[in-house]
Amino acid sequence: VPRWRQQWSGPGTTKRFPETVLARCVKYTEIHPEMRHVDCQSVWDAFKGAFISKHPCNITEEDYQPLMKLGTQTVPCNKILLWSRIKDLAHQFTQVQRDMFTLEDTLLGYLADDLTWCGEFNTSKINYQSCPDWRKDCSNNPVSVFWKTVSRRFAEAACDVVHVMLNGSRSKIFDKNSTFGSVEVHNLQPEKVQTLEAWVIHGGREDSRDLCQDPTIKELESIISKRNIQFSCKNIYRPDKFLQCVKNPEDSSCTSEI
């Protein structure tokens, strides 16, 4: 008789999830020699241990602590780039500006990027059919808790000037409910972080508005200022040109505003 299985509202675990996590771990250690002390089998075991046999609405940050410990990594604290709703451009930027890091440039972020996973209470099975949706089912699901945990740690590690890339095409350029708005902003350490500099990325070719004056940006400025961190904001009118100028800063067209 087939066992009754909980139906969740979100997509199920990504296919080949164990193989993908293990392969990503090995790839990461191959291209980041400083992380070759990491035992990828142990990393996978710790990852699995965080959610297997546990109710997928009952996951805690504590469940991920063994994984966090194994994935401990030092990134230059003054070279951190946060992002909200504009992941691809942020990653294109750190791909060119090699000394800056998004969360997905770290081992733990790289392992989980774009993946979904969950288990079931009291069985060692991975649920490939469905996983809890943050809104419709529960917020303490394996994926959400993972990203909350690693994002908090990443923000806590930041120092000096922290940059954040924001999507100027969205109705809420700064969204208090995003991971950046709900976790990272509140975990920047005022005794270490001097300034949060927002880069607002324009979507339209002819959009010359100053999106730094957007009400949601003013809201971000207020939150940050209350935390005794300075705030600055820049419009990136031409993201394509911006990337090109990061690649080739000596290009004559790169002196004008981008």
Partner: antibody, heavy 123, light 112 residues
């Protein structure tokens, strides 16, 4: 079985570009970093760069930074290496290569190689 | 970049006799994980290179046990206990401790 099959020999003019392909089979293409190595006639091997086929991220040797572009087509399980502004010194055999995984650790040695693509640059 | 220096550049050997190739690196190739990231390859005439040894002393799959690798952090040796005719070609050492991975100039082994 695991195979890397490269495109055929090319003859190119100075100043032009060449794009060499490397088709992977017998394994999950996105699970391994792909490297490119070249060898000029009678010379030693020289590493050019890598691509992560899953994300498309790359890293290049300083020497080739301005002239090489490594890309991939996930649907075709194929990696590409394009070298621009060709000069006579770029006449070489170009190889794609990847490591083996020994009990969940990258061996650090290129265990699998393509058959090589000879690129001849003439004026 | 780490510089790899091989010697000799040419090595004539009688079949059945032993052979030894040296390789020096400009920096230690010992990682904090305890592994030494030194590889040996053989490139037979008209072929792609083939991996013989990785992590300084571990033989790659299918490599005969007459091949062995040894060394310390910066000085490495590839030994062939009894050379066979099929062993002719160019031998390269390579470091993979850091990027860019770098190769030695090669040692050409030929049969006397």
């Amino acid at each position: 079985q695991m195979q890397l099959v490269q495109s055929g020999a090319e003859v190119k003019k100075t100043g032009s570009s060449v794009k060499v392909s490397c088709k992977a089979s017998g394994y999950t293409f996105t699970d391994y970093i792909m490297h490119w190595v070249r060898q000029a006639p009678g010379q030693a091997l020289e590493w050019m760069g890598w691509i992560d086929p899953e994300y498309g991220s790359t890293d290049y040797a300083q020497k080739f930074q301005d002239r090489v572009t490594i890309t991939r087509d996930r649907s075709m399980s194929t990696a590409y290496m394009e070298l621009s502004s060709l000069r006579s010194e770029d006449t070489a055999m170009y190889y794609c290569a990847r490591v083996a995984i020994i009990t969940t650790v990258a061996s650090g040695g290129f265990a699998y190689w393509g058959q090589g693509t000879l690129v001849t640059v003439s004026s | 970049d780490i510089v790899m220096t091989q010697s000799p550049l040419s090595l004539p050997v009688t079949p059945g006799e032993p052979a030894s190739i040296s390789c020096q690196s400009s920096e230690s190739l010992l990682h904090s994980n305890g592994k030494t990231y030194l590889n040996w390859y053989l490139q037979k005439p008209g072929q792609s290179p083939q991996l013989l040894i990785y992590w300084m002393s571990t033989r790659a799959a299918g490599v005969p046990d007459r091949f062995s690798g040894s060394g310390s952090g910066t000085d490495f040796t590839l030994k062939i206990s009894r050379v066979e005719a099929e062993d002719v070609g160019v031998y390269y050492c390579q470091q993979f401790l850091e990027y860019p991975p770098t190769f030695g100039q090669g040692t050409k082994l030929e049969i006397k």
